[in-house]
């Protein structure tokens, strides 16, 4: 099946201190390689979360990503602050061994607006 990365929401609004879910689904797990969430684009983009075993405070996967056929790579960000505002991208990589992983497709992005409480 052809790989497609889908972020259904173009934007989400969340009150400071609350949590929000950023949705991302894939149509294929091939080629093998990690899925990562970034805020922003280009060389200065910020890695927010990687589905590769690393622990990140305030961020959790929504589904059981240890299922071998899991294609839901949505994340929940808790205790949102104004600094979390921005556009978030779900990005699928093809594994690299001697070389870095290769980005092969990105979702369309979801903008997070943080509202004052």
């Amino acid at each position: 099946k052809e790989l497609k990365v889908t972020q259904p929401e173009k934007s989400v609004s969340v009150a400071a201190g609350d949590s929000t879910v950023l949705n991302c689904t894939l149509t294929s797990l091939l080629p093998v390689g990690p899925i990562r969430w970034y805020r922003g684009v280009g060389p200065s983009r910020l890695l927010i979360y990687s589905f590769a075993g690393e622990y990140v405070p305030r961020i959790r996967n929504v589904s059981d990503t240890t299922k071998r056929n899991n294609m839901d790579f949505s994340i929940r960000i808790s205790n949102v602050t104004p600094a979390d505002a921005g556009i978030y991208y779900c990005v699928k990589f093809q594994k690299g061994s001697s070389e870095p992983d290769t980005e092969i497709q990105s979702g369309g992005g979801t903008e997070v607006y943080v509202l004052a409480k």
Epitope: L29, L30, P31, V32, P34, F51, A52, G53, D64, T65, T66, K67, R68, N69, K95, S97, S98
Partner: antibody
Framework: DVQLVDSGGGVVRPGESLRLSCAAS????????MSWVRQAPGKGLEWLAG????????YYIDSVKGRFTISRDNSKNSLYLQMNSLTAEDTAVYYC???????????WGLGTLVTVSS | ALTQPASVSANPGETVKITCSGG??????YGWYQQKSPGSAPVTVI????KRPSDIPSRFSGSASGSAATLTITGVRVEDEAVYFC???????????FGAGTTLTVL
């Protein structure tokens, strides 16, 4: 420190059943997929079955499908392998193993020996 | 099926390479597992093609390209004598497989 302790092995007759256990400690058990791997005497490693962190999804090699059942109890930090209709070919050391994010293995149990003999 | 040499030998201090072929780079991740004696617990020396667990010495390294993976031991030591199994996870079939094992003898 991550620790996996296998138990439940022993000597059984062909056709009988056995339930293996693996007690996990030193990590958040409910966050990791787990697998069972065996090694017959003088042979290599053979992956048998895997289970997702939540326990809802299971995976088996064809040769044990329908005879073996992998399960887990996250409240007890324990992994299980129910083995039915055992044959002499099932004689092996059985290891539990913790899976990495991409379903390889990073930690292994010490193993428990299962002998099927009449 | 994964194919690896039955045995390799080296003198202390030499570099050893053990290859494992038969996987598809597009759908496969490789790992390497050390077993010092039959029936003893395997130890993971490499997972995810090239990731070394924190407690494994830096002389162990891994790589993968095309349909093969390679375990390299740079400056092999007597205590590295063991059987090394390559393993693979296939994201197409959701199945794990292992090679038959390579016996490393340090002369």
């Amino acid at each position: 420190d991550v620790q996996l302790v296998d138990s439940g092995g022993g000597v059984v007759r062909p056709g009988e059943s056995l339930r293996l256990s693996c007690a996990a400690s030193g990590f958040t058990f409910s966050s990791y997929a787990m697998s069972w791997v065996r090694q017959a005497p003088g042979k290599g490693l053979e992956w048998l079955a895997g289970i997702s962190a939540g326990g809802s999804d299971t995976y088996y090699i064809d040769s044990v499908k329908g005879r073996f059942t992998i399960s887990r109890d996250n409240s007890k930090n324990s992994l299980y392998l129910q083995m039915n209709s055992l044959t002499a070919e099932d004689t092996a050391v059985y290891y539990c193993a913790r899976e990495t994010w991409n379903h390889l293995f990073d930690y292994w149990g010490l193993g428990t020996l299962v002998t099927v003999s009449s | 099926a994964l194919t690896q040499p039955a045995s390799v030998s080296a003198n202390p201090g030499e570099t050893v390479k053990i290859t494992c072929s038969g996987g598809d780079y597009y759908s496969t991740y490789y790992g390497w597992y050390q077993q010092k004696s039959p029936g003893s617990a395997p130890v993971t020396v490499i997972h995810s093609d090239d990731k070394r667990p924190s407690d494994i010495p830096s002389r162990f390294s891994g790589s993968a390209s095309g349909s093969a993976a390679t375990l390299t031991i740079t400056g092999v030591r007597v205590e590295d004598e063991a059987v090394y199994f390559c393993g693979a996870y296939d994201g197409r079939t959701y199945i794990n497989t292992f090679g038959a094992g390579t016996t490393l003898t340090v002369l």
